[in-house]
Amino acid sequence: VPRWRQQWSGPGTTKRFPETVLARCVKYTEIHPEMRHVDCQSVWDAFKGAFISKHPCNITEEDYQPLMKLGTQTVPCNKILLWSRIKDLAHQFTQVQRDMFTLEDTLLGYLADDLTWCGEFNTSKINYQSCPDWRKDCSNNPVSVFWKTVSRRFAEAACDVVHVMLNGSRSKIFDKNSTFGSVEVHNLQPEKVQTLEAWVIHGGREDSRDLCQDPTIKELESIISKRNIQFSCKNIYRPDKFLQCVKNPEDSSCTSEI
């Protein structure tokens, strides 16, 4: 008789999840000399311990502390790029501008990027059938709590000028319910962070509006100002040209507004 299994609304754990995490860890530690001391088998042990045998709607930040400890990494605090709803461009940017870092350029972010995982209460099995959806099931699920934990730590580490890339094509350019809006904004440390600079990325080629005047950006400015952090905003009208100019800043066409 098959054992009854909880059906969640979200997709199940990414196939070959342990192997993927281990393989990513090995690759990352080979590429980043400062993380060569990391034992990837211990990293996986800490990862599995955070969610396996636990109810997938009852995960806490505390569950991830052993993993956080093993993945402790120092990135230049003044070279942090946050993003919201525009991950691909943010990653393309840091692949070119190698001295800047998104969360996914750190070990822990790299391990979990685009993956889903959950376990089942009181069994040592990974649930490959379904996992809780943040909206339909519960917010304290393994994936959401992981990203909340690493995002908070990443924001807390930031200093000087912090950049954030925002998607100008969305109805809410700044969304209070995004990870950036609900976690990172509130964990920037005013005693360390001088300015948050938003880069609003335009979608349409002929879009010449000043999206820095958007009501949601004004809301972001208000939140940031109340936290005693300065705010600035730039329109990136041509993201393709923007990336090209990051690659080749000497190009003559890069003196004009992008």
Epitope: A23, C40, D45, K48, K125
Partner: antibody, heavy 120, light 107 residues
């Protein structure tokens, strides 16, 4: 039927090295990890280290670091344990044992053991 | 390293007896605990994993319980073939560590 077959007994001089092999059959070699566990005469079990063949990575107990090298050859489905600078207290039966890569379960299959005697 | 402490180190019992062996971890290991049986001159054999799950093919008289730091292996009715040494082992973190063993002898 899964089988782990280890190499034969060895007698070694202090200061020398020994390499013990563990050939797996009856399962997908690259889907598992292999640990080495030793047992000195009349003593308990002591974990030495573990290799994941599909990634080619290994770790080991601090006690053995610098002396033990654990490797695997996917082409022959064989795991190896190389212990150097042997001393008399390394006299033991050495076992290889299999678990899943995700380490969610126990060592479900064990080799028959290899007696290594270190004596001058 | 996580220390695993078994008690008793040996015990004498008769066929049909209920036998209980305990294992204590020096820090919390959730349910990442296995129990093994070893007979003289043989390799260990897995009995229990995840603290309470019975390994395939193992008789139901063997059971495990506990989580965190305190664990128990119970043999409900000791059989002649159960006289052996039993080890607990944690697989919560590296290095993997075993208890020192409990020898079950015939009274």
């Amino acid at each position: 039927q899964v089988q782990l077959v280890q190499s034969g007994a060895e007698v070694k001089k202090p200061g020398s090295s020994v390499k013990v092999s563990c050939k797996a059959s009856g399962g997908t070699f690259s889907s598992y990890a292999f640990s080495w566990v030793r047992q000195a005469p009349g003593q308990g079990l002591e974990w030495m280290g573990r290799v994941i063949p599909f990634l080619g990575i290994a770790n080991s107990a601090q006690k053995f670091q610098g002396r033990v090298t654990i490797t695997a050859d996917k082409s022959t489905s064989t795991a190896y344990m190389d212990l150097s600078s042997l001393r008399s207290e390394d006299t033991a039966v050495y076992y290889c044992a299999r678990d899943d890569i995700a380490a969610l379960g126990p060592f479900d299959y064990w080799g028959q053991g290899t007696l290594v005697t270190v004596s001058s | 390293d996580i220390q695993m402490t078994q008690s008793p180190s040996s015990l004498s019992a008769s066929v049909g007896d209920r036998v209980t062996i305990t294992c204590r971890a020096s820090q919390g290991i959730s349910s990442w605990l296995a129990w093994y049986q070893q007979k003289p001159e043989k390799a260990p054999k897995s009995l229990i994993y995840a603290a309470s799950s019975l390994q395939s093919g193992v008789p139901s008289r063997f059971s495990g319980s506990g989580s965190g730091t305190d664990f128990t292996l119970t043999i409900s009715s000791l059989q002649p073939e159960d006289f052996a040494t039993y080890y607990c082992q944690q697989y919560n973190s590296y290095p993997r560590t075993f208890g020192q063993g409990t020898k079950v002898e015939i009274k």
